[in-house]
Interface confidence: low
């Protein structure tokens, strides 16, 4: 059972003597005599696992210590870390030329965990060990312990994992520390992009490329990369994520947007407050939504204030001549915080006994400029009916309009048009003829254009060919011709007129009078 | 038909746990979130947080961490809420309710359908 | 946190009677606003949302009113279904809090 001790987050210790709980156990050859395992306490009263030799007195040492497997767990270069102290030669009476003042460091790359004898002609020497002048001084107690320390690597390895071995060759020594690990690169975010766990290359110059992901709520801008340095340090980054709409940049995250405020785009720029006349209810708001009565066109940036239709057009006035009208506003006095304002011009036709029994005016009216999208505030109407009421309403429009579910912003003119002449009769009929008289109906005027004060009936007898004619004049549609000669043919024209002066004559009505006191009932247009 | 029915009343003893369920129906349960709402005895309605159906992530009022736990299954279309160290104040009615997850067009939020409630007594 | 201030407490009334129930915000809560009905032992049932907004199958002789700060619920013509317990609730920023409530009981 390992307990945990901190060391550099690079490195990833695989193994750690001090934090072995109970005896190491290593095997040592020769098995007595040799390397020897002894605890000692340090100064928080912790057990420290060493193993010692000193046999210095006696010549041709050869003591061996190997560890147990270690794991590689993927690294291809690992390093060695002892503590070891290391007794002068200088400062043993009586050893010169047995005693010495180094060791060797070996390992064994095997795919086996279980070995259980030392080979020594399978391992490879990593180096000769020796103290230098740099130690630590350790309390154990009522001693102190210099203690030196020194890292070696070794690589490229490729089994699963390996063994170490330390050769004494005549010196005194105590093993205090034995770590091994290998350096990683550390999880990381730079640029918003994260970086994982890297174990660093097989050489100690050789640069491992990393492509990182970005962050959570973020998203690629150019591809995110950094190199994996030996030691286990990141070197260059390249590229970088942007946070996504509704998320800004905060202690190297991507975090939501506060309420009240929005982020429309993935940009590095931070959550911007909601605009005029609009709000966020939620955190992480792409976009803010318009206050009631506010509202955005398709084409508003998420950036512009919410907007209103604007109020009604003012000061609406009317000049009529004849059949055509000619209107003038001023602007709104709200244009709802919009430049696209423009004008809409509505035409209703409203009967004279009800106003209220409107209908659009179709498409014989003509408008000028136009009667839709009009920048300016006037207009012309031509092509009216005479003598009629219209309702003009004039629309002002702007780009949200459209969104407003109960529109007020139109002004309204009644107005009458002039009379004008009558159009023609298109029917005149005989309804009843005699010998010397002709009762003649008329339906009124398609188009009266005004009120009809009276209708003139004109006639003459064919064969005169209207240089002698009469007329008769009455208010109704209706009248009879008498005083007619018997057994001759009659020519009758009818003509309605309005204070604006006479209509056209109506097409001829042909009629002959009868020889016979008996009475004809007619209904044609050429009654015989 | 659109639901959520809760698990029936629980009667607990001081120290204890509850857990009480909101089970959705008729509707797609990741499109809304689940909201918690406490009604203690002759009292008016608290809402005591909220979790997101779509990632699990609760978010707690204050006074509502700590003891409380939400959590679901997706699996069956439930909401859990979970007290521990029951106190004779946890004594109330539980609500869930929901509330859409997104605007889906809707510019205001909510709770449209509640459950029926859950009545958690807490005595010795 | 926004508080939510409902007025009165309680009122007796009489089947077709009209009343009117107010809720004040302790800020502006632009018209986040829901208004619930609850009968004894029942859940709470949406009425109005957005302040203003019918939910589907309320009658109309409910409606809201309202911006800012304060915002009305009026019963038109009261009704013996009506007895109940009204609670507003804003939506503007959590936490989301209730009113205290309103009684309506028969007169």
């Known amino acids: 059972v390992t307990g945990s001790r901190v060391y550099p987050a690079n490195e990833v210790t695989l193994l750690d003597s001090r934090s072995v709980q109970g005896e190491l156990g290593w095997i040592a050859s020769p098995l007595e005599g040799g390397w020897e395992e002894v605890s000692i306490m340090d100064e928080k009263n912790t057990p420290i696992r060493t193993y010692q030799v000193c046999n210095v007195m006696e010549p041709s040492q050869n003591n061996w210590l190997r560890t147990d497997w270690i794991t590689r767990e993927g690294a291809q270069r690992v390093y060695i870390e002892i503590k070891f102290t290391l007794r002068d030669c200088n400062s043993l009476p009586g050893v010169m030329g047995t005693c010495k003042e180094t060791f060797n460091l070996y390992y064994y790359e095997s795919d086996n965990d279980k070995e259980r004898f030392i080979r020594e002609n399978q391992f490879v020497k990593i180096d000769t060990i020796a103290a230098d002048e740099s130690f630590t001084q350790v309390d154990i107690g009522d001693r102190i312990m210099k203690l030196n320390t020194e890292i070696r690597d070794v690589g490229p390895l490729s089994k699963k994992g390996f063994y170490l071995a330390f050769q004494d060759v005549g010196a005194c020594i105590a093993l205090v520390s034995v770590r091994v690990f290998y350096k990683k690169c550390p999880l990381t975010v730079r640029n918003l992009a994260q970086f994982p766990d890297t174990i660093t290359g097989a050489d100690t110059s050789s640069l491992v490329e990393v492509r990182g992901s970005c962050v959570n709520n973020s998203e690629e801008k150019d591809v995110p990369k950094m190199y994996c340095g030996a030691d286990g340090e990141w070197l260059v980054p390249i590229g970088n994520c942007l946070c996504n709409a509704g998320h800004e940049e905060r202690s190297g995250e991507c975090q939501a947007c506060k309420i009240g405020y929005y982020k429309a785009l993935s940009t590095d720029a931070t959550c911007a407050k909601c605009p005029p006349h609009s709000y966020s209810v939620w955190e992480g708001a792409t976009s803010c939504t318009c206050d009631r009565g506010f509202f955005r066109a398709d084409n508003d940036a998420a950036s512009m204030p919410c907007t209103r239709p604007p109020s009604a057009p003012l000061n609406l006035i009317s000049n009529v001549n004849e059949t055509s009208v000619n209107l003038e506003w001023s602007s709104p006095q709200n244009t709802g915080g919009r430049q696209d304002i423009s004008y809409n011009v509505v035409c209703k036709k409203c009967g004279a006994g009800d106003p209220s029994k409107c209908r659009p005016c179709g498409s014989g009216v003509h408008y000028t400029p136009q009667q839709n999208g009009l920048k300016t505030t006037k207009v012309s109407i031509t092509d009216l009916l005479a003598h009629t009421n219209y309702t003009f309403e004039i629309w002002a429009v702007n780009g949200v309009s459209k969104y407003n579910p109960n529109p007020d912003q139109s002004v309204s003119v009644t107005v009458t048009t002039n009379q004008a002449a009558p159009s023609s009769i298109a029917l005149v009929q005989a309804k009843e003829v005699t010998r010397y008289s002709v009762a003649l109906a008329w339906l009124e005027p398609d188009r009266p254009n005004g009120v009809i004060l009276e209708y003139e009936v004109k006639y003459y007898e064919k064969d005169q060919n209207e240089r002698s004619y009469r007329i008769v004049r009455t208010a109704a549609r209706n009248t009879d011709i008498k005083g007619l000669n018997p057994l001759t043919s009659y020519v009758f024209h009818v003509r309605a007129r309005t204070a604006a002066g006479y209509g056209d004559f109506s097409e001829p009505l042909e009629v002959t009078t009868n020889t016979v006191p008996s009475r004809i009932i007619g209904d044609g247009a050429n009654s015989t | 038909q659109i639901q959520l029915v809760q698990s029936g009343s629980e009667l607990k003893k001081p120290g204890a746990s509850v857990k009480v369920s909101c089970k959705a129906s008729g509707y797609t349960f990741t499109d809304y979130s689940m909201h918690w709402v406490r009604q203690a005895p002759g009292q008016g309605l608290k809402w005591m947080g909220w979790?997101?159906?779509?990632?699990?992530?609760?978010t707690y009022a204050q006074g509502f961490t700590g003891r409380f736990v939400f959590s679901l299954d997706t699996s069956v279309s439930t909401a859990y809420l979970q007290i521990s160290s029951l106190k004779a104040e946890d004594t109330a009615v539980y609500y869930c309710?929901?509330?859409?997850?997104?605007?889906?067009?809707?510019?205001?939020?909510?709770?449209?359908?509640w459950g029926q409630g859950t009545t958690v007594t807490v005595s010795s | 946190d926004i508080q939510m201030t409902q007025s009165p407490s309680s009122l007796s009334a009489s089947v077709g009677d009209r009343v009117t129930i107010t809720c004040r915000a302790s800020e502006n809560i632009y018209r986040n606003l829901a208004w619930y009905q609850q009968k004894p032992g029942k859940a709470p049932k949406l009425l109005l949302y957005?302040?203003?907004n019918l939910a589907d199958g309320v009658p109309s002789r409910f409606s809201g009113s309202g911006s800012g700060t304060d915002y009305t619920l009026t019963i038109s013509s009261l009704q013996s279904e009506d007895f109940a317990t009204y609670y507003c609730?804003?939506?503007?920023?959590?936490?989301?809090?209730f009113g205290q409530g309103t009684k309506v009981e028969i007169k």
């Open positions: 609730q804003h939506f503007w920023g959590t936490p989301w809090t």
């Open positions: 979790i997101n159906t779509e990632t699990g992530e609760p």
């Open positions: 309710a929901r509330i859409p997850l997104y605007y889906y067009g809707s510019r205001y939020w909510y709770f449209d359908v």
């Open positions: 957005a302040a203003t």
